[in-house]
Interface confidence: medium
C-alpha cells in the first residue's frame, strides 16, 4: 500500500469539521495576469499581494496592477490600491521588504517614457500607509536595504549611477558614476565596481573595486583589474585578471579589502567561472568551473582564512555562468549539504556530505523503494534528488528540496531510486535524520511545505487539472489525511506559508476560469484546531544528531562536537507554537583524523581518512601567498576543519614560515591603495 495508507495510521479525529471552520476563501476582483506575494515582518500576519495585468495594445502595452493587504495571515484581504494612487507597479522589481521587523516596504512604479526619474511608494508601518516619492533617477535595480540600518537604501540607475538614501528613500544622492555592481557589506559599508572607459561589459576584467564606509563621503580603491566580486560570510572575494594572459584568480580579504591574499585555487580562463556556493563565518564552499563547456567543475572548501583550499568534490554539476547547480544547504542539520555530480557516462547522481564537505557519499536507498530502470543491480542503488537542474530541464519537478532550521532533521525532496537521476515522474521522499535515511513519502510530484516547526507537513499534488484537495501529515510524513478545501476545483499556482515554518496557516493560490473571465483566488487554512493542545515535556524525545551507532562513544561527532536535540515525538499531535525554540545540547568530542582537512598539497584517497601528498607536489616546497607575502608551509598534511570544536585525541602539527618575499601577485598591495573624499 502507498505510504500512510496502511492500517497503522492513527486518524486525526474530526479533522474535516475542524478544518472547514478554519478555511477562508478570498476571491480577488482581478483579471488573471500575474500575482506576487510578500510577507511583511515576522509573526505580524501581514501579507502584501500585488496582481498585475498587461493588455497588449497595437502600439504599446497597457498595464494595470492592484495591491492587497492582509493582516491575519491571508484569511482576509483588503484592496489598498488607492494608497498607491492606483499606480502601475513594476513587478520585475518586486516588493522590496525591509530587513527584520522594520515594517518597511518599497514599491517601484512604472512611469511614462519622458519623465525625469522613477517613482517609488514607501511605507514604514507594515503597508498601512504609503508615501509617494519621485526619484531623481530611473532605477535599474530594486532598492537594497542596509542589513544594519533599514533607513539606508542603495540603488543603481539606468545610467550606472550609484544612488544612496539615508532617510528611507525620502532624499537621494548620487555618490558615484560608472558603477557596475554594488553590495552592502557589514557596518553599513558599500562595495562597488566601477568602469573607466566604455561600459561594464567592455571593461570586464579592468574594473576597479571601491569601498565607502560613510555612505559616500569618502572612498577607498581596494582593488584593480577586477572581473567581479562577491561577499560570503566574513569573506570578501574578488576575481582578478592576471597580468600576462586572460586568466583570472580569486583573491580574498577578511578585513573589508584592506589586505588581500591570493586564494589557493586554480585560475580560470575567459569561458570559465567561480561561484561561491555557500559561506558562513567559518569557511566557504567554492565551485571552480572546468575548462571547456563541460557543465561541471570542482568544489573546494576553504580554511578559516578563505585562503588554503581542499578539493571537496570532483565533477560537480554546474552549467554555464549563472546557470544551474543542485547545491543545497540542508538547514535542518548542521554540516549537511546535497548536490549533484555529472558522471563519466553523463548521467547525473546525487551526493551528500554530513561533515561540511569533508566526505561525500551517495544517498542511502529508501527501504520502501525498488531500484528503477537506471540501476544495473536491482538490489543496489541510491536515492537521487531532483533540484534546480531538474527544474530548469522542465522535468516534472514542481519544487526544490525543502528543509527548515527549526524543523530539526527534516528534509523533503523529489527523487528517484536508481544509479542516477531518472527522467521518469519522480516521487517525494522524506528524511527525518538530516539525510542519513530516506522514506518514500508521497507517490508522484507534489508541492509541499512545513508548518509549526515540523508539527505539520502539507502537500498538494502537482497536476495539470484543477484541484480541490490538500494532504496533511502530523507525524513527519508517515501518515496522510486528505481534506477537500473547496467544492469547485481551482487551477493551482502555489502554496504560501510564512517563512520560517512557524506558522500554522497555509494559503493555496490559484485561479478559477469560466467562459468569460478568470480570477485569482486564495484559500487560507488554519491548522490550529488540528493541533488542539500545546506540546508538553512528555511530547519530546532526546535525539542524537548524526547518530549511526548509538552505543559508540564517538557516535554523533561531527566537526568536533555532538548535539542532542529535543524533538517532537511522531505520535504527539500538539502545537510546537510560534515561540518554539530548538532545544539542543552540544558536547565536545575527541579529535580524530576526520576533524582535519587535507592541507595544501595533500589529498584523501577514497575510503581513507589519512591525507597523502599529491604526487605532482611531492618533494616540492609548498609556498603560498598570504597578505602579499610568500609563505613556506611545513605540514604533515592536515589542518583543522573551520568551525571544528574537538579537543584532545590526535593533533597533527602544522607550521607556517614567513619567507618575507613579495608574492608574484598582480593585485594591489595595501601600501599602494589610494583613498579619496567627496
Amino acid at each position: 500500500s502507498a505510504p500512510g495508507e496502511d492500517e497503522e495510521c492513527g486518524r486525526v479525529r474530526d479533522f474535516v469539521a475542524k478544518l472547514a471552520n478554519n478555511t477562508h476563501q478570498h476571491v480577488f476582483d482581478d483579471l488573471r495576469g500575474s500575482v506576487s506575494l510578500s510577507w511583511v515582518g515576522d509573526s505580524t500576519g501581514v501579507i502584501l499581494v500585488l496582481t498585475t495585468f498587461h493588455v497588449p495594445l497595437v502600439i504599446m502595452t497597457f498595464g494595470q496592477s492592484k495591491l492587497y493587504r492582509s493582516e491575519d495571515y491571508g484569511k482576509n484581504f483588503k484592496d489598498i490600491t488607492d494608497l498607491i494612487n492606483n499606480t502601475f507597479i513594476r513587478t520585475e522589481f518586486g516588493m522590496a521588504i525591509g530587513p527584520e521587523n522594520s515594517g518597511k516596504v518599497v514599491l517601484t512604479a512604472e512611469v511614462s517614457g519622458g519623465s525625469r526619474g522613477g517613482r517609488i511608494f514607501r511605507s514604514s508601518d507594515f503597508a498601512k500607509n504609503f508615501v509617494q516619492t519621485d526619484l531623481p533617477f530611473h532605477p535599474l535595480t530594486q532598492m537594497m536595504y542596509s542589513p544594519q540600518n533599514s533607513d539606508y537604501l542603495l540603488a543603481l540607475s539606468t545610467e550606472n549611477g550609484l544612488w544612496v538614501s539615508k532617510n528611507f528613500g525620502g532624499k537621494w544622492e548620487e555618490i558615484h558614476k560608472a558603477v557596475c555592481l554594488a553590495k552592502w557589506g557589514s557596518d553599513n559599508t558599500i562595495f562597488f565596481t566601477t568602469y573607466a572607459n566604455g561600459s561594464c561589459k567592455a571593461d570586464l576584467g579592468a574594473l576597479e573595486l571601491w569601498r565607502t564606509s560613510d555612505l559616500g563621503k569618502s572612498f577607498k580603491t581596494i582593488g584593480v583589474k577586477i572581473y567581479s566580486f562577491g561577499l560570503g560570510g566574513r569573506f570578501l572575494f574578488a576575481s582578478v585578471m592576471a597580468d600576462k594572459d586572460t586568466t583570472r584568480r580569486i583573491h580574498v580579504s577578511t578585513d573589508q579589502g584592506d589586505t588581500w591574499s591570493m586564494a589557493q585555487l586554480p585560475s580560470v580562463g575567459q569561458e570559465q567561472f567561480y561561484s561561491i556556493l555557500a559561506a558562513n563565518d567559518d569557511m566557504v564552499f567554492m565551485h571552480v568551473d572546468e575548462p571547456g563547456d563541460t557543465g561541471f567543475g570542482t568544489i573546494f572548501t576553504s580554511d578559516d582564512r578563505g585562503i588554503v583550499y581542499s578539493k571537496s568534490l570532483d565533477r560537480h554539476l554546474y552549467t554555464t555562468t549563472g546557470g544551474e547547480t543542485d547545491f543545497t544547504n540542508v538547514t535542518s542539520l548542521r554540516g549537511v549539504y546535497i548536490t549533484s555530480v555529472l558522471s563519466e557516462d553523463n548521467s547525473i547522481q546525487t551526493m551528500i556530505t554530513f561533515d561540511q564537505g569533508g566526505r561525500w557519499t551517495h544517498l542511502r536507498k529508501p527501504e520502501n523503494s525498488e531500484c528503477d530502470a537506471t540501476a544495473k543491480n536491482k538490489n543496489e542503488c541510491s536515492l537521487h534528488i531532483h533540484a534546480s537542474y531538474s527544474i530548469s530541464q522542465k522535468l516534472n519537478v514542481p519544487m526544490a528540496p525543502l528543509s527548515e532550521p527549526n524543523a530539526v532533521g527534516i528534509v523533503i525532496a523529489h527523487g528517484s531510486v536508481g544509479d542516477a537521476i531518472s527522467v521518469m515522474v519522480p516521487d517525494v521522499y522524506i528524511s527525518d535524520d538530516g539525510g542519513y535515511s530516506w522514506t518514500k513519502m508521497l507517490e508522484g510530484p507534489h508541492y509541499y511545505t512545513i508548518l509549526d516547526s515540523g508539527g505539520i507537513i502539507v502537500a498538494i499534488e502537482h497536476s495539470s487539472r484543477p484541484i480541490n484537495v490538500i494532504k496533511f501529515s502530523t507525524d513527519e510524513g508517515q501518515c496522510w489525511q486528505t481534506y477537500t478545501f473547496t467544492r469547485d476545483p481551482i487551477y493551482f499556482t502555489g502554496l504560501a506559508s510564512e517563512p520560517g515554518a512557524r506558522s500554522m496557516n497555509i494559503s493555496i493560490w490559484g485561479f478559477t476560469e469560466s467562459f468569460l473571465t478568470s480570477q485569482w483566488v486564495s484559500y487560507t487554512i488554519d491548522f490550529k484546531d488540528i493541533l488542539e493542545r500545546n506540546c508538553e515535556e512528555k511530547d519530546y524525545t532526546i535525539w542524537l544528531a548524526h547518530s549511526t551507532d548509538p552505543e559508540d562513544y564517538e557516535d554523533g561527532c561531527i566537526l568536533g562536537y555532538k548535539e542532542q536535540f529535543l524533538r517532537l515525538r511522531k505520535s504527539s499531535v500538539c502545537q510546537n507554537g510560534r515561540d518554539y525554540v530548538v532545544t539542543k545540547q552540544p558536547s565536545i568530542c575527541l579529535c580524530s583524523l576526520e576533524d582535519f582537512l587535507c592541507d595544501f598539497g595533500y589529498y584523501r584517497p577514497e575510503n581513507d581518512s589519512k591525507c597523502v601528498e599529491q604526487p605532482e607536489l611531492k618533494g616540492h616546497d609548498l609556498e603560498f601567498c598570504l597578505y602579499g607575502r610568500e609563505e613556506h608551509l611545513t605540514t604533515n598534511g592536515y589542518r583543522k576543519i573551520p568551525g571544528d570544536k574537538c579537543q584532545g585525541g590526535v593533533n597533527p602539527v602544522r607550521e607556517v614560515k614567513d619567507l618575507k618575499k613579495k608574492c608574484t601577485s598582480n593585485f594591489l598591495s595595501p601600501e599602494k591603495q589610494n583613498s579619496k573624499s567627496n
Epitope: 551507532d549 548509538p550 562513544y553 564517538e554 545540547q585 558536547s587 575527541l590 580524530s592 585525541g649 590526535v650
Partner: antibody
C-alpha cells in the same frame, strides 16, 4: 550483568610505575568509550583520562599528561592505565567507567587503591 | 577548565524529607551534566544524565533540573537507601570535572 572490575593497585614509591587493568563484561566493550576517574583521600573526584571506543583517540587531564597512558584491548575486553613517574598526589582509588554517546559515566567499577608513598 | 561548585557539602535530613542539592558551573554547559550516587563499599551509580533524564531503574523520586550554569538534584521524599554521597559531573568539554560532593546523612 554489566560489570567492570579494576585490578593492579597497590603501594608504590614516588617515581615508580604501576599498571592498572579493568576487565569488562556483560556489554559490547568495543563500542564504548572508557574513562579512568580517581577519588583522592579527601573524597574529591578527578577525571584522569578517556579513550575512544576503537582505541585511536585519547585525552588526559593536565595533571597526568605525559606520565599516564590509557590503552585498551578490545579482543580481551580490557582497559589499561599505565602510570609512570608517580607522585604522592596520585594517591587515590582509581575507577574505570563506561561512556556511551548519550551518557558519559553510566557504569563504574568498584575501584582499586593506589598508594604512592616512600 | 570548567569548575563545578556543589552545595551544600553535607546535609542532615529525615526519611520523607525533600532534599535539594545544587551545582554551579563556572561557564555554560548546556545540559551536559550528570548526577552520581556513591555509597560506602559500593560502585558509583549513575542517576541522572543530560540534566533532567532519569537513568533506567532509578526511582522517580529523583529528578534533575536546570540548564546553562545552574543545576539541581532533587529527592522528593528521602528513603533510607538514599543516604549516600552525591556528585555532579560536567561532560560538555574536556577535561570533565566533578563537583565536590554532598553527603546526605540521617538526622
Amino acid at each position: 550483568e554489566v560489570q567492570l572490575v579494576e585490578s593492579g593497585g597497590g603501594l608504590v614509591q614516588p617515581g615508580g610505575s604501576l599498571r592498572l587493568s579493568c576487565a569488562a563484561s556483560g556489554f559490547t566493550f568495543s563500542t564504548y568509550g572508557m574513562s579512568w576517574v580517581r577519588q583522592a583521600p579527601d573524597k574529591r573526584l578527578e577525571w584522569v583520562a578517556i579513550i575512544s571506543s576503537g582505541g585511536s583517540y585519547t585525552y588526559y587531564s593536565d595533571t597526568v599528561k605525559g606520565r599516564f597512558t590509557i590503552s585498551r584491548d578490545n579482543s580481551k575486553n580490557s582497559l589499561y592505565l599505565q602510570m609512570n613517574s608517580l607522585k604522592a598526589e596520585d594517591t587515590a582509588v582509581y575507577y574505570c567507567s563506561r561512556s556511551s554517546s548519550h551518557w558519559y559515566f553510566d557504569v563504574w567499577g568498584q575501584g582499586t587503591l593506589v598508594t604512592v608513598s616512600s | 577548565d570548567i569548575q563545578m561548585t556543589q552545595s551544600p557539602s553535607s546535609l542532615s535530613a529525615s526519611v520523607g524529607d525533600r532534599v535539594t542539592i545544587t551545582c554551579h558551573a563556572s561557564q555554560g554547559i548546556s545540559s551536559n551534566i550528570g548526577w552520581l550516587q556513591q555509597k560506602p563499599g559500593k560502585a558509583f551509580k549513575g542517576l541522572i544524565y543530560h540534566g533532567t533524564n532519569l537513568k533506567d531503574g532509578v526511582p522517580s523520586r529523583f529528578s534533575g533540573s536546570g540548564s546553562g550554569a545552574d543545576f539541581t538534584l532533587t529527592i522528593s521524599s528521602l528513603q533510607p537507601e538514599d543516604f549516600a554521597t552525591y556528585f555532579c559531573v560536567q561532560y560538555a568539554q574536556f577535561p570533565y570535572t566533578f563537583g565536590g560532593g554532598t553527603k546526605v546523612e540521617i538526622r
